[in-house]
Interface confidence: medium
């Protein structure tokens, strides 16, 4: 989690002098509670936006927007704390809007936005806006939270962002997997335009079960330049297990831009459909 740093962060608007400050996520009002505190934010909205850095890189950002309730508590509103929590890592980043002038009611509802939290593909975040000062220990909460799921790099607009392109999002391996005979799978995929090795990760499962009955990794050496964008064919000869018939094939590239952390592509072969009643197998093969 980080802030997009391509321009000075501003929160001022007509009728309000405001500055954005880094925050420890532990506002002073927790430690020194106030008697009078503002009400909670209204209509918190989180959207996926895209922002360019000065270097020309494109990043996905969380666009946070909320409004104020039309009550007298805005007289005691001193600012807001914006918190973004990445759910799988528990990493949290906060900023604080510090109001340098008192808010007054005007003919339009007060609206605030902030679009500088850089988010990662395929991650879920909890976004919280706390009005400041925070309430006394037993006071009514004056924050609003929403979860926000960032699409993965398969998403058309995400695909062209810098983090996705760095992890190989423009590579489409177009994987095909076919069963040749009882023991064999043929995996075919398109190589990227980089002389890097690949790994094929095969995991097989019994029909209708989720614990694996076979796993293995296969190393595909780096292709030569003349093989770029060509199809690579891999034949896997497996242990014949009755019922170990559902195969998930995952291809992991090792591009220089993402090394061990490149996007993996996968394809699945389902178990063959079983007829309701077994048909007798003829002793001879008819010619028609």
């Amino acid at each position: 989690l980080r802030l997009l740093d391509h321009r000075a962060l501003v929160c001022s608007q007509p009728g309000l002098n405001c500055t954005v400050k880094n925050s420890t996520c532990l506002d002073d009002s927790w430690i020194h509670p106030r008697n009078l505190t503002p009400s909670s934010p209204k209509d918190l909205q989180i959207q996926l936006h895209f922002a360019h850095t000065q270097q020309g890189d494109l990043f996905p950002v969380a666009h946070i927007e909320w409004t104020l309730q039309t009550d007298a508590s805005i007289l005691y509103l001193e600012g807001a704390e914006l918190s973004v929590l990445q759910l799988n890592t528990n990493e949290r980043l906060c900023v604080r809007f510090e109001f340098l002038s008192k808010l007054r009611h005007h003919h339009r509802r007060w609206r605030f936005t902030f679009s500088h939290f850089v988010v990662d593909p395929d991650q879920e975040y909890e976004v919280t806006v706390h009005h400041l000062p925070k309430p006394i220990p037993d006071g009514d909460p004056n924050h609003q939270s929403k979860n926000f799921l960032v699409p993965d790099c398969e998403h058309a607009r995400m695909k062209v962002t810098t983090p996705c392109m760095s992890s190989g999002s423009l590579w489409d391996p177009n994987i095909t997997v076919e069963t040749l005979e009882a023991h064999q799978l043929r995996v075919s995929f398109t190589l990227w335009n980089e002389s890097t090795h690949y790994q094929i990760l095969l995991t097989s499962f019994p029909h209708m079960e989720n614990h694996s009955c076979f796993e293995h990794m296969h190393h595909i050496p780096a292709p030569r330049p003349e093989e770029f964008h060509q199809r690579s064919n891999v034949t896997l000869t497996l242990r014949n297990l009755k019922g170990c018939c559902r195969h998930q094939v995952q291809i992991q590239p090792f591009f220089s831009s993402c090394l061990n952390d490149c996007l993996r592509h996968s394809a699945t072969v389902s178990c063959p459909e079983m007829p309701d009643t077994p048909e007798p197998i003829p002793d001879y093969m008819p010619l028609w």
Partner: antibody, heavy 131, light 107 residues
Amino acid sequence: QVQLQESGPGLVKPSETLSLTCTVSGGSISNYYWNWIRQSPGKGLEWIGDIYYSGSTNYNPSLKSRVTISVDTSKNQFSLKLSSVTTADTAVYYCARDGELANYYGSGSYQFYYYYGMDVWGQGTTVTVSS
Amino acid sequence: DILMTQSPSSLSASVGDRVTITCRASQGIRNDLGWYQQKPGKAPKRLIYAASSLQSGVPSRFSGSGSGTEFTLTISSLQPEDFATYYCLQHNSNPFTFGPGTKVDIK
């Protein structure tokens, strides 16, 4: 190198459950199949069943209704339970590892061939079913 | 189930003899076959895997051949330590099945 050691009671009463454990040392239990095989006195070898380290099992249909094979990856062990035993279950019971990998590389196309078969065996433990 | 048969069931031979044991499968098993040697009171020991590949550490006088339904184990020059019972094992499909064994003893 990998070694296997069977353990369990040598005498089991008819109708009771035979329980054996195989301890794997010198290597990991992961990414292999682990088998139980038995050999009745003066008879040939009979495959009982196997288990993958993930817990996926395969049993000989002739024994399936009575057999349970389980694995404990934290202890590097796998176990056999055979219920409702009779004197016909008197045998030497072996545990064995199943799995060997050979890769054949072509140019442009790649062949990966998995050869399986019991390559490492325990020394066997005799189980007698008798009242 | 795939039935494995072996012939002969027993044979008597002398040190230095060339010995051939045959294993037949009731249906095609590709080359998914191993050969094992067992001495009294001991666990089987694998000699050959994939029908014709020599297990590491096994003397080169042992060789295997065949594919499909018919397989052969050959001992080119029988040594005193080779007197034992030999089994074939198919692992082409479950249940895996062993041949009944061929006992090789001293003539």
